[in-house]
Interface confidence: medium
C-alpha cells in the first residue's frame, strides 16, 4: 500500500512514544503499520494513550465495530496473539498493562477521510514476583483499573441511570440493572489478559431516585478466554449457584473452590430481591505474578510455528501451530482423535534452555472432516516429558510412585488449567495425552517458566527422578459466601495461593 513504507517499528527501550505516521498532522491514507513493544522478562509494559482520533462510522453500533480506520492492540505478535481490542473514533483507549513480553499495535487506514491520529507513550516497569505471593488482589472494579470500556452487559436499564459502568463495588451512584429483570441477563467484565480469578464480591444498590433497595440473592458465574466460547462454572456436575446478597449495601465475598484462568467473566443473576441491581469486585492475579511463571511464547507468538511439532496431525487447520493457548480458535488434533494413551504428543521447542515450572493446558474446537461436525475436545489427563537436546527425554515423575506423573487436564474445551511442577531445565517440552473427552484429543498449550539464569535448577532438580508437587486444589473444599462489611479482605490468605 502506498502509505505503508517504513511505518512499522519495534520498540525495545525502557520508555518511548508511539505515534501515527505524520503526527500531529493528519495520518496518510492506505496505511498498514505495525508497532511492537518488546519487553525483557520480568518487565511489565504500560501503554497510555494521550491523543486518539481516528475516522469512524457515525452509525457504529458497538465498540470494535470499526469500518474505515482502526488501531488493533494485540497481546503478542499481531494476528498470532489474542486481540485485546479494536479502536476507532475519538474514545481514547484506557491504560493497558501487559506482562506477556510483547504488545503490538496495528494501524490501518483506508483511502478516504483522515483524522489527527494517535499519540501514546509506553513504559517498561520491572516486576519482581514475590515467592509468597497471594492470588487475592482486587482486579480493579472499585479502583478503576478495570476501565469503563471493559465492563458491559446483556442489556441496560432504559433510563440510563443503572449502566454496567455503575457496577463498581462501593460505587455511590446506583449499580447495574438490566432492561428487564430475568435470569438470562448478565454483567460482563473483560480483564483483557488471561487472569487467575479467585473470588467475587457483590453488593446490591439503593436507588438514588426512589430510595428503594435492590440486590441479587444468587448468581451463576460464566467464564471465557475469547468472549465467544463460554463455560458455566460448576461444582461437581451441576452449575454452581453462588449465594449472594441479603440486602442492598453489605458486601458478600464468594471464594472460588479453585482459581479459574480466564479473560472474560460474566455474572448471571438467578434470583433477586425486588429487582436486579449489582455492584462488583473481582479478585485474583496474573499468571505471571508467581515466581518464574512467564508465558514462554505460545500465546504471544514468540515461539514460532516451526518450533511447535506433534506426533501426528489431523489436517492443516488443526496442525501443531494451531496449538497456541487462547490465541488459536481451533487447536491441535492428532490424526486419530481416539488414539492409544501416550501414543500422541505435542512438542514445544523453547529455542534455548529455560527453567520450566508449569504448563497451561486448554482444549480445542475443530472439525471432523469426515462427519463435518465441530468437535469440542479436551485432554482429561496427561504426562509431561522434557529434554535439553531433543534426544534424551525425562518424564516429570510422581515423587510418591517414582512413575511418570499423571496430571489432571481439562474439564471443558475452552477453560484452561494451570499445572505447576518443580523447576526443570528444558529446551523441549512434550505433552502426552493419556485420557480425553468423548470428542477425542484436542489441545492448546502454553509453557510457563523463566530464563535459566533467573532460576537455576538445583542439583537435586537436575537428577533423573524429578520431584514434583502438583498443586491442584490448595483451596477450601467448598466455596464460601462471606459478608465482609465495608472492606473485603481475605481472612485467611493462604486459601488463595496461586496453584
Amino acid at each position: 500500500k502506498t502509505g505503508s513504507e517504513d511505518c512499522s517499528k519495534n520498540f525495545t527501550s525502557p520508555n518511548g512514544t508511539i505515534e501515527s505516521p505524520g503526527f500531529p498532522e493528519k495520518y496518510p491514507h492506505n496505511l498498514d503499520c505495525t508497532f511492537t513493544i518488546l519487553a525483557k522478562p520480568k518487565m511489565e509494559i504500560i501503554l497510555q494513550f494521550l491523543i486518539f482520533d481516528l475516522e469512524h462510522d457515525p452509525l457504529q453500533v458497538g465498540e470494535g465495530d470499526c469500518k474505515y480506520d482502526w488501531l488493533d492492540i494485540w497481546d503478542g505478535i499481531p494476528h498470532v496473539g489474542p486481540l485485546i481490542g479494536k479502536y476507532c473514533g475519538t474514545k481514547t483507549p484506557s491504560e493497558l498493562r501487559s506482562s506477556t513480553g510483547i504488545l503490538s499495535l496495528t494501524f490501518h487506514t483506508d483511502m478516504a477521510v483522515a483524522k489527527d491520529g494517535f499519540s501514546a507513550r509506553y513504559y517498561l516497569v520491572h516486576q519482581e514476583p514475590l515467592e509468597n505471593f497471594q492470588c487475592n488482589v482486587p482486579l480493579g472494579m472499585e479502583s478503576g483499573r478495570i476501565a469503563n470500556e471493559q465492563i458491559s452487559a446483556s442489556s441496560t436499564y432504559s433510563d440510563g441511570r443503572w449502566t454496567p459502568q455503575q457496577s463498581r463495588l462501593h460505587g455511590d451512584d446506583n449499580g447495574w440493572t438490566p432492561n428487564l429483570d430475568s435470569n438470562k441477563e448478565y454483567l460482563q467484565v473483560d480483564l483483557r489478559f488471561l487472569t487467575m480469578l479467585t473470588a467475587i464480591a457483590t453488593q446490591g444498590a439503593i436507588s438514588r431516585e426512589t430510595q428503594n433497595g435492590y440486590y441479587v440473592k444468587s448468581y451463576k458465574l460464566e467464564v471465557s478466554t475469547n468472549g465467544e466460547d463460554w463455560m458455566v462454572y460448576r461444582h461437581g456436575k451441576n452449575h454452581k449457584v453462588f449465594q449472594a446478597n441479603n440486602d442492598a449495601t453489605e458486601v458478600v465475598l464468594n471464594k472460588l473452590h479453585a482459581p479459574l484462568l480466564t479473560r472474560f467473566v460474566r455474572i448471571r443473576p438467578q434470583t433477586w430481591h425486588s429487582g436486579i441491581a449489582l455492584r462488583l469486585e473481582l479478585f485474583g492475579c496474573r499468571v505471571t505474578d508467581a515466581p518464574c511463571s512467564n508465558m514462554l511464547g505460545m500465546l504471544s507468538g514468540l515461539i514460532a510455528d516451526s518450533q511447535i511439532s506433534a506426533s501426528s496431525t489431523q489436517e492443516y487447520l488443526w496442525s501443531p501451530s494451531a496449538a497456541r493457548l487462547v490465541s488459536s480458535r481451533s487447536g491441535w488434533f492428532p490424526r486419530i482423535p481416539q488414539a492409544q494413551p501416550g501414543e500422541e504428543w505435542l512438542q514445544v521447542d523453547l529455542g534455548t534452555p529455560k527453567t520450566v515450572k508449569g504448563v497451561i493446558i486448554q482444549g480445542a474446537r475443530g472439525g471432523d472432516s469426515i462427519t463435518a461436525v465441530e468437535a469440542r475436545a479436551f485432554v482429561r489427563k496427561f504426562k509431561v516429558s522434557y529434554s535439553l537436546n531433543g534426544k534424551d527425554w525425562e518424564y516429570i515423575q510422581d515423587p510418591r510412585t517414582q512413575q511418570p506423573k499423571l496430571f489432571e487436564g481439562n474439564m471443558h474445551y475452552d477453560t484452561p488449567d494451570i499445572r505447576r511442577f518443580d523447576p526443570i531445565p528444558a529446551q523441549y517440552v512434550r505433552v502426552y495425552p493419556e485420557r480425553w473427552s468423548p470428542a477425542g484429543i484436542g489441545m492448546r498449550l502454553e509453557v510457563l517458566g523463566c530464563d535459566w539464569t533467573d532460576s537455576k535448577p538445583t542439583v537435586e532438580t537436575l537428577g533423573p527422578t524429578v520431584k514434583s508437587e502438583e498443586t491442584t486444589t490448595p483451596y477450601p473444599t467448598e466455596e464460601e459466601a462471606t459478608e465482609c462489611g465495608e472492606n473485603c479482605s481475605f481472612e485467611d490468605d493462604k486459601d488463595l495461593q496461586l496453584p
Epitope: 433510563d159 426512589t210 428503594n212 435492590y214 425486588s274
Partner: antibody, heavy 121, light 108 residues
C-alpha cells in the same frame, strides 16, 4: 397467577384505627415491595407508603406519616395497612398494589380489589 | 414532591374519535418512570402503559404513549365503547410517587 386479595369493607368511628389485609399469591412476597394507595370518593389516587417485605423496611408519604403503619407476615404472605386517628376525610377505597416486573419504576401491574373504609360517627 | 397535572380533567367524545390526554410534571421525569392507568367505576386501576410508551399485556394497540421531560401524552387512536373510563398518569422518578388528578372520558 398473581393475585392480591384484600379484606372486606369497614365502618369506623372518628379517632378509631383500621387495619386492612392484602393476601398475595402467585409470587414470593419476600422478594417484592407492597404499596398502598388511597382513593377518596370521586377523587384521584394517592400513594400512602410501601413495605419491603424481606426486611420490613417501610417508607411513607409525608401526608400519612405518623398515622399509617404498613406491616407484613411472610408466613401467611399477607401485607397489612393500619391507619390510626381516623377522620371523616379518610373515608376512601384503599388499594394494595405491587410492581413485580417494574420494581425500579414502580408501575403497578397488580392491584388488590380495594377495601372501602367509611369513617362516620 | 413532583406534581402531576393532567388535562383535560374530563372530556366527552364519540366512538371512533381520536382522544389525547396530556400529563405535565412539575419537574423533569425520566421516561422510564412515567406510567398510565385506566380505571372503571367500582374497579381497581389497571396498568395501561408503562415506561411512557410500552403497552401492558393485553392492552389494544389503539392506545399509545409518548413524551419526555415534563410533558407526556396518552392517545387513543379510535375510541371504543369499553374505553370510557378515568385515566391516570403516574411517576416514580422521585419519591414519593405521585399520580395525576385523572382524566374522565365520557360518552358524548
Amino acid at each position: 397467577e398473581v393475585q392480591l386479595v384484600q379484606s372486606g369493607a369497614e365502618v369506623k368511628k372518628p379517632g378509631a384505627t383500621v387495619k386492612i389485609s392484602c393476601k398475595v399469591s402467585g409470587f414470593n412476597i419476600k422478594d417484592y415491595y407492597v404499596h398502598w394507595v388511597q382513593q377518596a370518593p370521586g377523587k384521584g389516587l394517592e400513594w400512602m407508603g410501601r413495605i419491603d417485605v424481606h426486611d420490613d423496611e417501610t417508607k411513607y408519604a409525608p401526608k400519612f406519616q405518623g398515622r399509617v403503619t404498613i406491616t407484613a407476615d411472610t408466613s401467611t404472605d399477607t401485607a397489612y395497612m393500619e391507619l390510626s386517628s381516623l377522620r371523616s376525610e379518610d373515608t376512601a377505597v384503599y388499594y394494595c398494589a405491587t410492581p413485580i416486573y417494574g420494581a425500579r419504576e414502580a408501575w403497578f401491574a397488580y392491584w388488590g380489589q380495594g377495601t372501602l373504609v367509611t369513617v362516620s360517627s | 414532591d413532583i406534581q402531576m397535572t393532567q388535562s383535560p380533567s374530563s372530556l366527552s367524545a364519540s366512538v371512533g374519535d381520536r382522544v389525547t390526554i396530556t400529563c405535565t410534571a412539575s419537574s423533569s421525569v425520566s421516561s422510564s418512570y412515567l406510567h398510565w392507568y385506566q380505571q372503571k367505576p367500582g374497579k381497581a386501576p389497571k396498568l395501561l402503559i408503562y415506561r411512557t410508551s410500552n403497552l401492558a399485556s393485553g392492552v389494544p394497540s389503539r392506545f399509545s404513549g409518548s413524551g419526555s421531560g415534563t410533558d407526556f401524552t396518552l392517545t387513543i387512536s379510535s375510541l371504543q365503547p369499553e374505553d370510557f373510563a378515568t385515566y391516570y398518569c403516574h411517576q416514580y422518578y422521585r419519591s414519593p410517587p405521585t399520580f395525576g388528578g385523572g382524566t374522565k372520558v365520557e360518552i358524548k
